[in-house]
Each structure stands twice: as structure tokens, then as C-alpha cells.
Interface confidence: low
């Protein structure tokens, strides 16, 4: 009862709500809901009812299982959806479903910040740019991952010869997708074409 | 027709607290979602709270919002609003209705006044 | 949110009069949901109209309701003394629900 369910899914995709568990048998009613009382659709009497939404048009209701189609969804469809039963014996059962809808992350752009030659050894200064978004990170030298510390949108090391990687990546990712940007040097210290 | 009786309302200081309650009769009161709904003297209506049939879910209206909660006892058919943190501006008549197929208000109750004042 | 607003504040007639209340919504109100509620001194209010025009259970002939997206009117069409109140809009196609600031019908 009320167990809420999370569910992460890419922007554009068709989604498919549904419970674990099989419905109450014959039930009465049934009701799909976003936030707490706006209504999707209703099954009713044998019949779905699909109420005016920003969603008319782009859900579908199978009785059989209560599980709600939703197609194209967008970031604007983040919400909490509630599946409300109504039982023949007159109690009502609900589940909860929290969707969030991310969109696929841009390809990142990798920034130099700082590049300098210091004896043989290269100070870098790397920072991955991307468009106001709530993603991880992963450095890669040379396909190499950099150490977990390192994790963040700015990469800072000192690059001695025994150490020296040609190419730089930074790896954006979230639940849904994940884009590369990678940036290469020139020993000893100099900015090569990508 | 169902019925709605509200109790609990009276006097409290600011930063007290009451509990209101709302005797429903008539009804299978387990199948209907429930709000309070408020209204300080001379002044319009201002809905607060919202459960629903189960209790499972319940949503507070910005205003109140940390300070009240609303819940229910379906086996007693009574609603309750734990109002914490009282202040002036929550002095107003409290009633209690039944939010209809989640859109309207309909039937209320009589109303219980709630004044805060030191 | 979505704000009501009611005009007039106050409307005074005589009875057999018709009466003409209006709220106008600050954004279209979603598949005009929308209802009306009569409320008398020292009493609950009470349902009248919802979705914009359907009468409440055992609501006389003589209220109706009409209008769509922004722009929505409460008719009473001869006024009874009975009828003499204040009257509120809430819309429901939007969270939070939100009420008008009321209408007072009173006797000229």
C-alpha cells in the first residue's frame, strides 16, 4: 500500500507504468493520477475515460494489468503517478510510481584551463564543460580511468614523462546515457587537434 | 447523504499546538479522499490539506506546510489536522470536506473556529 | 498557481431580479473545471456548480453556470430571498485548487 516505486527513463522514450503486482480481482475502479489529484485516465464501467492532460493523446490504459503507456515522454513529465484502485469491497488501494525523465547528456566540451611547461614535467588543468546538468564524471588518460578522487568536472595533474598521456577524455554520464569529449597533447606540452 | 462534524477548535497560543477532528457519518468514508479547507474571519476560502481514501498519500498547502498534517482513522470514519507551530494568521474557521472525485468540495462540515492569539 | 478573481465584490438587487457574477482566471482553466459555491452567514459553503455548468444534486433550475478558459459567469436568473449570500468559484484543473475571493449577493 503506497510503496513508491523509481523509475528513470530517457527523454523522447515510451514508458510503460505498471505495478508488480497483480491487480485485486474484479475491481471496481481504477485511476491514474500525476501529482496527487490530476487525473490521466479512469477505467470505469468496462470503459477508460481519458481526461483533458498534457498527456491526452500520448497514454494508453491496459484494464487487464493497470499498466499506463506513455509515449515521447519529456523532462516536463518528472512526477510522482499514482495508480488508485477502488476494490469491490469499497477500500481503495494505491501505488506510486516516481518517473524522472532525463534527457540524454550533451557531448561535452573540454576546456584548457591551464597548460604549462614546468623542467620536463606538464602542469594540466582540464574542465569539462556542459549545459546546466546533474551528471557524473570520469576522467580518462589515454583510456586510462583516473582515480576516483578525480571524479569531477575539473581535471588537475601534473604529467611527468614516465607518465605522459597523449589524450585526455572526460566522460559525462547519467542513468540514462552517457557522451565523450576527448582533447589531445603534444609532448611535451602543447595542445594537438582533437 | 453523508454528514461531516468538525471538533477540536478553541484558543491557542502562538507556536502551540491543536488537533482538529472530523466525524464523518453516512458515508463509506474509507472510499472518499478528504480536505480541510479554511476560512479566516471575513475573509474567503483557502483549501490546507488533502489525504486520500486509503491515507496513503496527503499534500499541504504551501502555507502550512511543515506545521500541519493531515491524517485519518478509517476504522473510526475520522479525519484529523495536527496543527503545529500556530500562528495569528492561521486563526480561521476550519472545515472539513469531502474532496469529491478529487476535483470539488462537496458535501463540508459545519466548521470548527481556530483562534490563535496570545 | 492559478487566481480567481470574482467582480463584483458586492452586488445589490431585489428579488425577481436577475443576478450576473463573474470570475475570471489569471490562466485558462483546464477542461473548464471549474465550480461554483453559495455560502450563508454562519453556514458551510455549498456546491452549486461543477465543470463550469452541471448543477449539483438538488441545486434549483434558476442557478446556472456557463463560460471556458479564462472567463466563466454564475447566473441566478430570478432571485429568491433565500438566494441572498456569498458566492465562490474554486478551479480544479490545476494543484493547489484555488478559490475566488467571493461574490455577496445581498438585498437592495
Known amino acids: 500500500q503506497g510503496h513508491l516505486v523509481h523509475m528513470t527513463v530517457v527523454s523522447g522514450s515510451n514508458v510503460t507504468l505498471n505495478i508488480s503486482e497483480s491487480l485485486p480481482e474484479n475491481y471496481k475502479q481504477l485511476t491514474w493520477f500525476y501529482t496527487f489529484d490530476q487525473k490521466i485516465v479512469e477505467w470505469d464501467s468496462r470503459k477508460s475515460k481519458y481526461f483533458e492532460s498534457k498527456f491526452k493523446g500520448r497514454v494508453r490504459l491496459d484494464p487487464q494489468s493497470g499498466a499506463l503507456y506513455i509515449s515521447k515522454v519529456q523532462k516536463e513529465d518528472n512526477s510522482t503517478y499514482i495508480m488508485r484502485v477502488l476494490k469491490k469491497t469499497g477500500n481503495e488501494q494505491e501505488w506510486k510510481i516516481k518517473l524522472q525523465v532525463l534527457d540524454p547528456v550533451p557531448k561535452p566540451v573540454i576546456k584548457i584551463e591551464k597548460i604549462e611547461d614546468m623542467d620536463d614535467n606538464c602542469y594540466l588543468k582540464l574542465s569539462c564543460v556542459i549545459p546546466g546538468e546533474s551528471v557524473n564524471y570520469t576522467w580518462y588518460g589515454d583510456k586510462r580511468p583516473f582515480p576516483k578522487e578525480l571524479q569531477n568536472s575539473v581535471l588537475e595533474t601534473t604529467l611527468m614523462p614516465h607518465n605522459y598521456s597523449r589524450c585526455y577524455t572526460c566522460q559525462v554520464s547519467n542513468s540514462v546515457s552517457s557522451k565523450n569529449g576527448t582533447v589531445c597533447l603534444s609532448p611535451p606540452c602543447t595542445l594537438a587537434r582533437s | 447523504e453523508g454528514q461531516l462534524l468538525e471538533s477540536g477548535g478553541g484558543l491557542a497560543q502562538p507556536g502551540g499546538s491543536l488537533r482538529l477532528s472530523c466525524a464523518a457519518s453516512g458515508i463509506t468514508f474509507g472510499r472518499y479522499a478528504m480536505s480541510w479547507v479554511r476560512q479566516a474571519p471575513g475573509k474567503g476560502l483557502e483549501w490546507v490539506s488533502l489525504?486520500?481514501?486509503?491515507?496513503?498519500?496527503?499534500y499541504h498547502a504551501d502555507s502550512v506546510k511543515g506545521r500541519f498534517t493531515i491524517s485519518r482513522d478509517n476504522s473510526k470514519n475520522t479525519l484529523y489536522l495536527q496543527m503545529n507551530s500556530l500562528r495569528a494568521e492561521d486563526t480561521a474557521v476550519y472545515y472539513c470536506?469531502?474532496?469529491?472525485?478529487?476535483?470539488?468540495?462537496?458535501?463540508w462540515g459545519q466548521g470548527t473556529l481556530v483562534t490563535v492569539s496570545s | 498557481e492559478i487566481v480567481l478573481t470574482q467582480s463584483p465584490g458586492t452586488l445589490s438587487l431585489s428579488p425577481g431580479e436577475r443576478a450576473t457574477l463573474s470570475c475570471r482566471a489569471s490562466q485558462s482553466v483546464s477542461s473548464n473545471y471549474l465550480a461554483w459555491y453559495q455560502q450563508k452567514p454562519g453556514q458551510a459553503p455549498r456546491l452549486l456548480i461543477y465543470?463550469?455548468?452541471s448543477r449539483a444534486t438538488d441545486i434549483p433550475d434558476r442557478f446556472s453556470g456557463s463560460g471556458s478558459g479564462t472567463d466563466f459567469t454564475l447566473t441566478i436568473s430570478r432571485l429568491e430571498p433565500e438566494d441572498f449570500a456569498v458566492y465562490y468559484c474554486q478551479q480544479y484543473g490545476s494543484s493547489p485548487r484555488t478559490f475566488g475571493q467571493g461574490t455577496k449577493v445581498e438585498i437592495k
Open positions: 489525504i486520500s481514501g486509503s491515507g496513503g498519500s496527503t
Open positions: 470536506a469531502i474532496y469529491n472525485n478529487y476535483n470539488w468540495f462537496d458535501p
Open positions: 465543470d463550469a455548468s
